[in-house]
């Protein structure tokens, strides 16, 4: 049985970014038909993970897993698909809590982003890592880069691959 | 608001193992009162992640996220806590699909474990990585080590931190 998962292409792109492997990221970006400016924006985010070393990739993976398996996400999925549940199926759309976290990572202040992460994982090392990544992204990315990253995310969320 | 998540201490231990950072693993193991033999067993698993390099940590994180956010896990959580849902709460117990995967990782054959992973993430690079990790664990761990790892997992699943 092949399980339906919540927006698999989103997690593929997220892990390609966090992994630091540019070849895998290039492939994921091709799969979602990313434009040149969108590619540039995502690679700037990847640079932050690479510069911050292995620990940032693993800790951010932990945050993503924690949010994705949180009451928030499960509750959302449940409430959005009560009818589906009776048929034992579940919607594949991305969990709003994950979406919110990604939006804050790009458009929020460092404090807002860290506060959102803290709702799910309050370990000091996790929060410190979240702040370092957020500061790096704010330093590297122009407003235009952030808009391009958001437009790519919209493309991902509405993609048939999601 | 601090969100309830499905067995947070399990994910702490999993990511500490997969991260390859022994200091984080020591901390997680202390939290669940791991015995010396249980510590030894978990460190043998961690050695496999370290030896297999960064890619195994990221890919296994992807598998864990995918399973944790799969229809299987969400469905289980929902069906197990229908009453709770009416009160807008969700049980924190670990998802049975995650439990199954971990059990097979320790006690199943490589084929059984890879087949379980393939239900959630069929990318060849993911499955190859899963097989390498499983073979490494089978080579490194004695039957006694595996029993100790399983006893620690029981401790985690029944812990108030779960």
């Amino acid at each position: 049985v092949k399980m339906a998962e919540t927006c698999p292409i989103f997690y593929d792109v997220f892990f390609a970014v966090a992994n630091g492997n540019e070849l895998l990221l290039d492939l994921s970006l091709t799969k979602v038909n990313a434009t040149e400016p969108e590619r540039t924006a995502m690679k700037k985010i990847q640079d932050c993970y690479v510069e911050n070393g292995l620990i940032s990739r693993v800790l951010d993976g932990l945050v993503m897993t924690t949010i994705s398996s949180s009451k928030d996400c499960m509750g959302e999925a449940v409430q959005n698909t009560v009818e589906d549940l009776k048929l034992n199926t579940l919607g594949r759309e991305i969990c709003p809590a994950v979406k919110r976290g990604v939006d804050l990572f790009l458009t929020g202040t460092p404090d807002e982003y860290v506060e959102q992460v803290a709702q799910y994982k309050a370990l000091p090392v996790v929060l410190e890592n979240a702040r370092i990544l957020k500061n790096c992204v704010d330093a590297k990315m122009t407003e235009e880069d952030k808009e391009n990253a958001l437009s790519l995310l919209d493309k991902i969320y509405t993609s048939p691959l999601c | 608001v601090k969100m309830a998540e499905t067995c947070p201490i399990f994910y702490d231990v999993f990511f500490a193992v997969a991260n390859g950072n022994e200091l984080l693993l020591d901390l997680s193991l202390t939290k669940v009162n791991a015995t010396e033999p249980e510590r030894t067993a978990m460190k043998k698993i961690q050695d496999c992640y370290v030896e297999n390099g960064l890619i195994s940590r990221v890919l296994d994180g992807l598998v864990m996220t995918t399973i944790s956010s799969s229809k299987d896990c969400m469905g289980e959580a929902v069906q197990n806590t229908v009453e709770d849902l009416k009160l807008n709460t969700l049980g924190r117990e670990i998802c049975p699909a995650v439990k199954r995967g971990v059990d097979l990782f320790l006690t199943g054959t490589p084929d059984e474990y890879v087949e379980q992973v393939a239900q959630y993430k069929a990318l060849p690079v993911v499955l190859e990585n899963a097989r390498i990790l499983k073979n490494c664990v089978d080579a490194k761990m004695t039957e006694e080590d595996k029993e100790n790892a399983l006893s620690l997992l029981d401790k985690i699943y029944t812990s108030p931190l779960c």
Partner: antibody
């Protein structure tokens, strides 16, 4: 208009080396992964190597691992394939291509490995 | 590695015919499949990506369908310039792999 032009092919003895080049134009070269694909005479297509947009990561087919190295110079918009320890079975037309679904191809350059 | 198979390996058809070529992947590749046309002595030409999206400039007589493991390329009305070899390729994951090709010649 996207253009890819390969060069550097020729006749080489078994065990010898050759460096292929692919000059790219018409797109932002550093934004895209680039690839080498080959075709032995009368045979099908075989992926050989890929390199990420900024050259941080690469991958090679098992048949060429340890012998071939892909690289790129983004300042020159050029892709390279360094081929060492060549064997008769490496005889093929070598194409460079852009994007993972090989949207654009060069015209190819023939590499013949023979004594 | 993902194996790609194509059928038939060759087919003879007449101008105006509608033909279908099948490509099968050894495991689920979602819709990450491309189709190419190659004429003797020439580089391959990209026809379709994403299983069904037509490359710009490719005539609409070409169409692709499928998802998961089974895919088809259809040419609705064969023209003299369409006699060539057709290849499928998966780009779901490295290493990228091609089908062995289907040669379409004049009956």
């Amino acid at each position: 208009e996207v253009q890819l032009v390969e060069s550097g092919g020729g006749l080489v003895q078994p065990g010898g080396s050759l460096r292929l080049s692919c000059a790219a134009s018409g797109f932002t070269f550093s934004t895209y992964a680039m690839h080498w694909v080959r075709q032995a005479p009368g045979k099908g297509l075989e992926w050989v190597s890929s390199i990420s947009g900024r050259g941080r990561n690469s991958d090679h087919a098992d048949s060429v691992k340890g012998r071939f190295t892909i690289s790129r110079d983004n300042s020159k918009n050029t892709l390279y394939l360094q081929m060492n320890s060549l064997r008769a079975e490496d005889t093929a037309v070598y194409y460079c291509a852009r994007t993972e679904y090989f949207h654009h191809w060069g015209q190819g350059t023939l590499v013949t490995v023979s004594s | 590695d993902i194996q790609m198979t194509q059928s038939p390996s060759s087919l003879s058809a007449s101008v105006g015919d509608r033909i279908t070529i099948t490509c099968r992947a050894s495991q689920d590749i979602n819709n990450y499949l491309a189709w190419f046309q190659q004429k003797p002595g020439k580089a391959p030409k990209s026809l379709i990506y994403g299983a069904s999206s037509l490359q710009s400039g490719v005539p609409s007589k070409f169409s692709g369908s499928g998802s998961g493991t089974d895919f088809t390329l259809t040419i609705s009305s064969l023209q003299p310039e369409d006699f060539a070899t057709y290849y499928c390729q998966q780009y779901s994951s490295y290493p990228f792999t091609f089908g062995p090709g289907t040669k379409v010649d004049i009956k």
